[in-house]
Amino acid sequence: MMTGTIETTGNISAEKGGSIILQCHLSSTTAQVTQVNWEQQDQLLAICNADLGWHISPSFKDRVAPGPGLGLTLQSLTVNDTGEYFCIYHTYPDGTYTGRIFLEVLESSVAEHGARFQIP
């Protein structure tokens, strides 16, 4: 039975040209994480394999950095980076857990304005 839960950073916004950390955390399970895949819509951005380490898509090599931890850092953000991101945790013996993050990339002034009036 799958008892674990994925906690994510949820819906986040960031400035165009800036960077953002996408984070997921698997809790409430003792299952062993064998691999974490990071996907944007239907595109595979990166893999972190428990034995063989990080692998980054050649298309994103210059803008994606592994970590911190099992998270992913997106750099030099553009408006086209707006959208859904998924962390897919492959575990043994539980199976697959998926977390969703929505990223909105805003023009600099809009991001600043939004931050000033953010409701906690």
């Epitope: 691999q35 895949n37 595979l44 893999i47 692998h55 697959t96």
Partner: antibody
């Protein structure tokens, strides 16, 4: 043209070590990880481990963590894989391969290692 | 890790035949599947990546398809140089290979 050229066949006695080389050409050696894999007779390919020539960092699957060593000589664009404490089950064709993101795009021709007393 | 099972393991065919090789995963492979060709004593050659993308320089008679756990490699009209062993590889969960399919001359 990307090429990976491996060293020749080896015959070793049980308990000995073997070191296989893989010379890369046609691309910037430090920009891609090199993997080592093997295929025993009648078996499927299996991964031994990986090295990032840029920083020398190595990764191994559990099965080979204590017996395999992977190194590079970046000045010679060459990767090496040494396997110690050889036994008959290590008789296999050993391959080096370049990984491009998530899959292997260029491979060496293979090196047959025979372990026999 | 996902286990890949290819079928058939051996296949006898003639020049001009249409050939289909199947690769089945023990779990969803999510289209993260690759096909290689290997000839005796030679380096494996990348044919198809991400299920259906033809690698540069590979003839268009080779094609790939599939989703979920089932994938196929098709050679539309077998040529003399196509007699070889073909194997699949997945990277959705672990990095694993199929056992190979040997295509022989009938």
């Amino acid at each position: 043209e990307v090429q990976l050229v491996q060293s020749g066949a080896e015959v070793k006695k049980p308990g000995a070590s073997v070191k296989v080389s893989c010379k890369a050409s046609g691309y910037t050696f430090t920009e891609h990880s090199i993997y080592w894999l093997r295929q025993a007779p009648g078996q499927r390919l299996e991964i031994i481990g990986r090295i990032d020539p840029k920083n020398g960092r190595t990764y191994f699957v559990d099965k080979f963590k204590n017996r395999a060593t992977i190194t590079t000589d970046t000045s010679a664009s060459t990767a090496y894989m040494e396997l110690s404490s050889l036994r008959s089950e290590d008789t296999a064709v050993y391959f080096c391969a370049r990984i491009d993101g998530f899959y292997f795009d260029f491979w060496g021709q293979g090196t047959l290692v025979t372990v026999s007393s | 890790d996902i286990q890949l099972t290819q079928s058939p393991s051996f296949l006898s065919a003639s020049v001009g035949d249409r050939v289909t090789i199947t690769c089945k995963g023990s779990q969803n492979v999510n289209k993260y599947l690759v096909w290689y060709q290997q000839k005796p004593g030679k380096a494996p050659k990348l044919l198809i990546y991400s299920t259906d993308n033809l690698q540069s320089g590979i003839p268009s008679r080779f094609s790939g398809s599939g989703s979920g756990t089932e994938y196929t490699l098709t050679i539309s009209s077998l040529q003399p140089e196509d007699f070889a062993t073909y194997f699949c590889y997945q990277y959705n969960n672990g990095f694993t290979f199929g056992q190979g399919t040997k295509v022989e001359i009938k």
